[in-house]
Interface confidence: medium
């Protein structure tokens, strides 16, 4: 007959690593006589034999957790007692290992530029997963604005347009990697005016284009206000490219006004607006434009017949009692003055005076005269007729003109529209547009209108040595 023997645990419990939903087994091998009674505890709490999550076999020497949960973490002990000697105990830990799991994934976010955005990414896993973020196809780098928080969330300070895009978070530990779904960060930008409309000082009956460019996300809409009310006339052309809206308001100017460009976009239930204003004033460069009373008709006079384009419509000013006779008389008087000028100056001056007094005319509801382009006026005044112009201005200052000469129809160049700005808004003087082969001689009054581009009349390229460098105001 065997002698009684106190229990001895021959295989002490060891630490067991187990994955969630997998099986974990603790073995507690005991030698004793008589056979011991073996009980199991978890964190010092007795495991009940009828708990269906556990299986206890081999006379209690094997404890199996049938489907490990992350809450099964803890210290498991087996206690063996057979009444001989004291009870014996061995303990081991269960470490529940867990592949990364994203418990709170990021969601789509719309945020206004300049604010702070937080994309959540809460994770579980053992070992604790490290969290990183991907934007588009590339790993996202942290910087002074962009940080991954301890919680795994992505925080972006002072959100910029370039932060917009698709993001996903990545949770990684030694057991695996988990990816969130792609989410979209949309950055909304308050409407902002990039290019404000410019103020214009124009002649009556001019066409003016006011341009306003705005940016924003969503793309703003642009509306125009004239003197506080919606614009009643004019045409608006709009184009959108790369989130920039370009609006051009073309106006036919018959009165001065304050024009405001308003750019608006919507952010949720709120709107953002930006405004810029420009004035359009009417330059008083001649009385006839001030009242702009007149009509368009073919030129039937003689003095400017060779200068003006054949069959062209010209503007006649009805502030004169008999406009056609009055204007012809004015040009006739001016013509006599021109007899004394140099052969270089005369054709240019004739072209200037004829085109200024008999301006090209656009018929319509309001007949519109088209003034000479500023650059052509300057070329006549400063290049072709520099000496004469200086002398004439000197006489004017000293009051030496004979009766009626104060009406000499000489434009003030600086008040005329620039061809550089809008080549369609003014009249060119064809006699200043030379043929290449005519550079060395002054063209006849009936020369054609090709273009060449010499800046002045240097002695090296022309047969007459003319210095254009005279001071003119």
């Amino acid at each position: 007959e065997k002698l009684p023997k106190a229990p001895v645990i021959t295989t002490p419990l060891e630490t067991v690593d187990a994955l969630v939903e997998e099986v974990a087994t603790f073995m507690c091998a005991v030698e004793s006589y008589p056979q011991p009674e073996i009980s199991w505890t978890r964190n010092k709490i007795l495991i009940k034999l009828f708990d269906t999550r556990y299986s206890i076999r081999e006379n209690g020497q094997l404890l199996t957790i049938l489907s490990v949960e992350d809450s099964d973490d803890g210290i498991y002990c087996c206690i063996a007692n057979n009444g001989v000697g004291g009870a014996v105990e061995s303990c081991g830990a269960l470490q529940v290992k867990m592949k990364p799991k994203i418990t709170r994934p990021p969601i789509n976010v719309k945020i206004i530029e300049g604010l702070k955005a937080v994309l959540p990414c809460t994770t579980m896993g053992n070992p604790k997963p490290s969290v990183s973020w991907i934007k588009g196809d590339n790993a996202l780098r942290e910087n002074s604005r962009i940080a991954v928080l301890e919680s795994g969330s992505l925080r972006i300070h002072n959100v910029q347009k370039e932060d917009a895009g698709q993001y996903r978070c990545v949770a990684k530990n030694s057991l695996g990697t988990a990816y969130s779904k792609l989410v979209k960060l949309e950055v909304e930008v308050f409407a902002r005016i990039l290019r404000a409309p410019e103020s214009h000082n124009v002649t009556f009956g001019s066409f003016v284009t006011l341009r306003c460019t705005a940016i924003g996300i969503p793309v703003p809409t642009i509306s125009w206000i004239e003197n506080g009310n919606a614009v009643s006339s004019g045409s608006i052309q709009e184009s959108v490219k790369d989130r920039v809206i370009d609006s051009r308001l073309q106006l036919f100017i018959t009165k001065p006004g304050l024009y405001t460009c308003i750019a608006t976009n919507k952010h949720g239930e709120k709107f953002s607006t930006a405004k810029a204003a420009a004035t359009v004033s009417i330059a008083e460069w001649s009385k006839s434009q001030k009242d702009s009373q007149g009509y368009c008709a073919q030129y039937r006079g003689e003095v400017c017949d060779a200068v003006l384009a054949k069959d062209a419509l010209v503007f006649f000013n009805t502030s004169y009692r008999d406009p056609e006779d009055a204007q012809e008389l004015l040009i006739h008087t001016a013509w006599n003055e021109l007899k004394a000028v140099s052969p270089l100056c005369r054709p240019a001056a004739e072209a200037l005076l004829c085109n200024h007094l008999f301006q090209e005319c656009s018929p319509g509801v309001v007949p519109t005269p088209m003034p000479i382009c500023r650059e052509y006026c300057l070329a006549v005044k400063e290049l072709f007729c520099a000496k004469e112009w200086q002398a004439m201005e000197g006489k004017a200052h000293r009051g030496l003109y004979r009766s009626g000469m104060h009406l000499l129809p000489v434009p003030e160049c600086s008040k005329l529209p620039s061809m550089h700005r809008d080549p369609t808004a003014c009249t060119r003087l064809p006699y200043l547009d030379y043929k290449k082969e005519n550079i060395t001689t002054f063209p006849s009054i009936t020369s054609s209108r090709p273009s060449a581009d010499i800046p002045n009349l240097p002695a090296s390229t022309s047969s007459f040595a003319v210095s254009p460098a005279y001071s003119m105001t």
Partner: antibody, heavy 124, light 107 residues
Framework: EVQLVESGGGLVQPGGSLRLSCAAS????????IHWVRQAPGKGLEWVAS????????YYADSVKGRFTISADTSKNTAYLQMNSLRAEDTAVYYC?????????????????WGQGTLVTVSS | DIQMTQSPSSLSASVGDRVTITCRAS??????VAWYQQKPGKAPKLLIY???SLYSGVPSRFSGSRSGTDFTLTISSLQPEDFATYYC?????????FGQGTKVEIK
């Protein structure tokens, strides 16, 4: 969109030669003037040469006259600056610029479009 | 050659200040004078042409004027983006000349 793109710059020894090109697009090359303007390191702008495409007339600064030649190929919309007998004082960023407008009018326009510049270094 | 003498060669100013830069031609010239703005490492940009015409897209705080052989560029209310070097240029004669430049710095 108007564009001017210079090329051909680089390092050259004193007495050597270089040819700069200015490729133009977005405007009517044949009725514009093309200018070369240079800027020595830390210095101001210095006009070098001009060509008036439709007439072929050319003008040069005294400092480069006889050494530099400006030309244009209107079929290729390209202007050139042939630089010979280069000196250390020719070291600069060379810009090409254009001004529009016909004949006399062009001088009133200013140089409204410029290239990004190309660096010419003359050093032994 | 026509010389363009620009003054001052540099100036310090604050945002909101009115700034005036002058160019004096060595002899009588036409209105074929332009003003440019240049920032470091960039090409110049046209501001004013024909002595007083504002180039398209240039803010209206910039203006140009002429009195005899003196040409003036005025910035009515200096903005942060206006700190740069400014040049005048004449093309009144076939030999173009630039002023020596005025650097506008932050005070």
């Amino acid at each position: 969109e108007v564009q001017l793109v210079e090329s051909g710059g680089g390092l050259v020894q004193p007495g050597g030669s270089l040819r700069l090109s200015c490729a133009a697009s977005g405007f009517t090359f044949s009725s514009s003037s093309i200018h070369w303007v240079r800027q020595a390191p830390g210095k101001g702008l210095e006009w070098v040469a001009s060509i008036y495409s439709s007439s072929g007339s050319t003008y040069y600064a005294d400092s480069v006259k006889g050494r530099f030649t400006i030309s244009a190929d209107t079929s290729k919309n390209t202007a050139y600056l042939q630089m010979n007998s280069l000196r250390a004082e020719d070291t600069a960023v060379y810009y090409c610029a254009r001004s529009g407008g016909e004949f006399y009018i062009t001088s009133y326009y200013g140089m409204d479009y410029w290239g990004q510049g190309t660096l010419v270094t003359v050093s032994s | 050659d026509i010389q363009m003498t620009q003054s001052p060669s540099s100036l310090s100013a604050s945002v909101g200040d009115r700034v005036t830069i002058t160019c004096r031609a060595s002899q009588s010239v036409s209105s074929a004078v332009a003003w440019y703005q240049q920032k470091p490492g960039k090409a110049p940009k046209l501001l004013i042409y024909s002595a007083s015409s504002l180039y398209s897209g240039v803010p209206s705080r910039f203006s140009g004027s002429r009195s005899g052989t003196d040409f003036t560029l005025t910035i009515s209310s200096l903005q942060p983006e206006d700190f740069a070097t400014y040049y005048c240029q004449q093309s009144s004669s076939s030999l173009i000349t630039f002023g020596q430049g005025t650097k506008v710095e932050i005070k």
